[in-house]
């Protein structure tokens, strides 16, 4: 086979045409990523044959390998083919595109592999980095191939800078499968024990008729072997387990336990691992904080949530005021103590449409025979303020006076505002704050007082105005935690009688 | 910690659909494609295809299409692959697999075996 021109490697211009010309004594035929593009094929009257490929109005995605190979049924060397490589440099194109199935890379042994980023130009300097660093990798870059190498199990991309342009490639995904046909499972009857108690542990493999068991575990390293029983679950086909059983456990078979399993027909091995933990006794511990003061809020449900580890399980109460607490027939209390995994446990209480006699002192208190613990709040009822009155006087002393009483919990706030222009606000003027020290014409006096039965504060607050020289309306608001509520009064000049 | 765990083995007759389901666990399933892949008795890793768990799109090898399809169930963060006319070609250990960025993740593979 001969090709003109000979290459191996080409470098041509954007758009420009160019023609590649492959002859020899048999047909032949040029190939471009598996397929034949069109080509002029003619013999020579001295019997060469020939092929000729036009490439017009190049691009940088003509970038890539040319073969030319003998289109013969006569059963030629099929190894007889020429490799060219062409470069198309374009600035408008990156990296060459990939194939889905270029960029995930699998492999089940350590191998050197190549990451095929490759660009349209061969004088760019390409970098290798994994996607999650900026770190050049130090891996050998062919322009025709890519990045080839010994990859770990990660996923990278290649930069390169084209102009003043940083350009990134698609990620490259590298699986390597540590081969295992074998599927091996560990699971223990509980991985905290006390001392005393006993330790059983099943591994379990699935798919294969014949494999031996291996298990590592504490006892065995002081030379103390236990013989493990194996059967087969006939209920499921393929299912063997080996149990591994330790009556009466010290605090040294603390550790981990290792099932390695090996089948000797494909010289396939697996292993898992467990880790048993063997306390001196049992114990209960609060996990993350709850504050002392909780807070719920007026016919609204709220749950209280106490989170703890604990071994072996516990009973839980819950106490309010000293008093055992139950889930009510009603419906008003629910309780519920959830186990989220082998030791960790949830207790919830639900107040469901809180009343103001569910506040007080609440107390969960989880223990078994080995410990205790137990956790305390007070829960503060909130309920939100309403004005309960508004009223209006005029005493005999000429200043008139406005009254204002309401009540929630916690303790509200009050703001007094007034219009005085009755037209203009509160849409397009802002009402005036009243009642400040500085203010001569109004002065403010408010008294605040528990009620205890009840459970909330009242305010009442009244406001002296000196003199009222036409029609104000006044704005008594009251503001706490959870709501705000405002009534308005219409106050009239002495000299005009309202109507 | 990311994990996958499959189906167990399958005997099929030639011509009989197989299905094996991957269920995710330990990372929010929807974050990573799926890929499936097989590895036959005494041959290399065989790339399938596929799966985004988030849109649910999938895109096979030229050689597997329109026989392979694979689906998932978000709810239970399990991806399915189906093989439609199997022959005793395809007799393999299939696994499924997904990538964190900082390595990757594998089921325990599942053997299927087409035999009559």
């Known amino acids: 086979l001969v090709v003109t021109p000979p290459g191996p490697e080409l470098v041509l211009n954007v758009s420009s045409t160019f023609v590649l010309t492959c002859s020899g004594s048999a047909p032949v035929v040029w190939e471009r990523m598996s397929q034949e593009p069109p080509q002029e094929m003619a013999k020579a009257q001295d019997g060469t044959f020939s092929s000729v490929l036009t490439l017009t109005n190049l691009t940088g995605l003509d970038t890539g390998e040319y073969f030319c190979t003998h289109n013969d049924s006569r059963g030629l060397e099929t190894d007889e083919r020429k490799r060219l490589y062409i470069f198309v440099p374009d600035p408008t194109v990156g990296f060459l595109p990939n194939d889905a199935e270029e960029l995930f890379i699998f492999l089940t042994e350590i191998t050197e592999i190549t990451i095929p980023c490759r660009v349209t130009d061969p004088q760019l300097v390409v970098t290798l980095h994994e996607k999650k660093g900026d770190v050049a990798l130090p891996v050998p870059y062919d322009h025709q191939r890519g990045f080839s190498g010994i990859f770990e199990d990660r996923s990278y991309i290649c930069k390169t800078t084209i102009g003043d342009r940083e350009v990134d490639s698609d990620a490259y995904y590298v699986y390597r499968l540590q081969v295992s046909s074998i599927n091996v499972s560990v699971n223990a009857v509980q991985t905290v024990v006390r001392q005393g108690e006993n330790i059983t542990l099943m591994c379990i493999v699935i798919g294969n008729e014949v494999v031996n068991f291996e298990w590592t575990y504490p006892r065995k390293e002081s030379g103390r072997l236990v013989e493990p029983v194996t059967d087969f679950l006939l209920d499921m086909p393929y299912h063997i387990r080996s149990i591994l059983h330790i009556p009466s456990a010290e605090l040294e078979d603390s550790g981990t336990y290792t099932c390695n399993v090996t089948e000797s027909v494909n010289d396939h091995q697996d292993e898992k691992a467990i880790n048993i933990t063997v306390v001196e006794s049992g114990y209960v511990r609060l996990l993350g904080e709850v504050g002392t003061l909780q807070f719920a809020e007026l016919h609204r449900s709220r749950t209280l949530q106490v989170v703890f580890e604990a071994y072996p399980p516990p009973t839980v109460l819950w106490f309010k005021d000293n008093r055992t607490l139950g889930d009510s027939s009603a419906g008003e209390i629910a309780l519920s103590t959830r186990n989220v995994s082998e030791t960790r446990y949830v207790s919830e209480l639900t107040l469901v449409r809180v009343k103001v006699a569910e506040a007080g002192h609440y107390t969960m208190r989880a223990f078994h025979e080995d410990a205790e613990v137990q956790l305390s709040f007070q829960l503060q009822i909130n309920v939100p303020v309403r004005v309960l009155e508004l009223s209006e006087s005029h005493p005999d002393s000429g200043e008139q006076t406005v009254r204002c009483r309401g009540r929630g919990m916690p303790q509200p706030n009050i703001i007094w505002s007034a219009c005085r222009d009755l037209k203009r606000c509160p849409r397009e003027l802002p009402p005036t704050l009243l009642g400040n020290s500085s203010e001569e014409e109004s002065q403010l006096e408010t008294n605040v007082t528990y009620w205890e039965e009840e459970q909330e504060f009242e305010v009442v607050s009244t406001l002296r105005l000196q003199h009222v020289d036409r029609p104000l309306s006044v704005r008594c608001t009251l503001r706490n935690a959870v709501g705000q509520d405002t009534q308005e009064v219409i106050v009239v000049p002495h000299s005009l009688p309202f109507k | 910690q990311m994990q996958l765990v499959q189906s167990g083995a399958e005997v099929k007759n030639p011509g009989a659909s197989v299905k094996v389901s991957c269920k995710a666990s330990?990372?929010?399933?929807?974050?990573?494609?799926i890929q499936w892949v097989r590895q036959a008795p005494g041959q290399g890793l065989e790339w399938m295809g596929w799966l985004n768990p988030n849109s649910g799109d999938t895109h096979s090898a030229q050689k597997f299409q329109g026989r392979v399809t694979m689906t998932r169930d978000t709810s239970i963060s399990t991806a399915y692959m189906e093989l439609s006319g199997p022959t005793s070609d395809d007799t393999a250990v299939y696994y499924c697999?997904?990538?964190?960025?900082?390595?990757?993740?594998w089921g325990q593979g599942t053997l299927v075996t087409v035999s009559s």
């Open positions: 330990g990372y929010p399933f929807s974050a990573y494609y």
């Open positions: 697999a997904t990538h964190g960025g900082d390595r990757s993740y």
